[in-house]
Amino acid sequence: IPAPSIRLVPPYPSSQEDPIHIACMAPGNFPGANFTLYRGGQVVQLLQAPTDQRGVTFNLSGGSSKAPGGPFHCQYGVLGELNQSQLSDLSEPVNVSFPVPTW
């Protein structure tokens, strides 16, 4: 099943002590999915979307960006036929830099 979209969302962090907000969105035909956020291959957080929403926002407390490892990815899972869990491909990576540019 298709990979989700991932994006850093406001309020953007201006230092390593600020919280990080990362939205992960599945295609619209997968509402209510279960989402996993990874950093450097390690699970950071799991969230389930409401039944009529296609995504979630992961709120990472200040200092999370100091954890070792690579960029953030996310993935979602849905129940397919015969209640088998299906996992999406991993999203593209998103990197957090300080400060995040505002346009």
Epitope: S5, R7, V9, G28, P50, Q53, R54, G55, T57
Partner: antibody, heavy 122, light 107 residues
Framework: EVQLVETGGGLIQPGRSLRLSCVAS????????MHWVRQAPGKELEWVAV????????QYAYSVKGRFTISRDNSKNTLYLEMNILGPEDTAVYFC???????????????WGQGTTVTVSS | DIQMTQSPSSLSTSVGDSVTITCRSS??????LSWFQHKPGKAPNLLIY???SLQSGVPSRFSGSGSGTDFTLTISSLQPEDFATYYC?????????FGPGTKVEIK
Amino acid sequence: EVQLVETGGGLIQPGRSLRLSCVASDFRFSNHAMHWVRQAPGKELEWVAVISSDGSNRQYAYSVKGRFTISRDNSKNTLYLEMNILGPEDTAVYFCVRSHLGPEWYYGMDVWGQGTTVTVSS
Amino acid sequence: DIQMTQSPSSLSTSVGDSVTITCRSSQSISTFLSWFQHKPGKAPNLLIYDASSLQSGVPSRFSGSGSGTDFTLTISSLQPEDFATYYCQQSDYLPFTFGPGTKVEIK
């Protein structure tokens, strides 16, 4: 079928105020951010404002900031746009638009209403 | 603000033809791009979101591609009901911005 119906448009004199309403049906209104988008005659579509699902976050286009206020009443499944100090440049069809299955602006847009026409003229 | 441009601004074509519309953003918007179809007096209709995802209920003859700054909408075999104006729109940053539109007319 998901539906958005805008009302409140009409002919209004410059400097006056007007309130547009948008009634939503067949979806859980309180779970979705909502937008207003407008299109002036012969012009491009212009995003006007957005409000998050719980009403806590509102954002506006520069052209309307300070004059327009977006609000919502989730108990009535209704979105509003209060427009003050109207000028001829505000003449347009105003569309109510649902966020694409999400509570904030960054989910994009999916379902649109048919629009209501606002004409500002003396 | 992010500027969106579209080409062509209009085109005349026939039923059964393949049509390609391009959209370009003034800076990278990743894949946060949607395509809408609009007919006069009607509500605009979402066709494609996230650059390439087909909206539920939209015929498979519509497809989207691209990322960064360059995007394409393709209609593989034009049907009579496809004659309309098509708009691209970015949702990476506020304010959301739209392309000027491409009007697809019957030859």
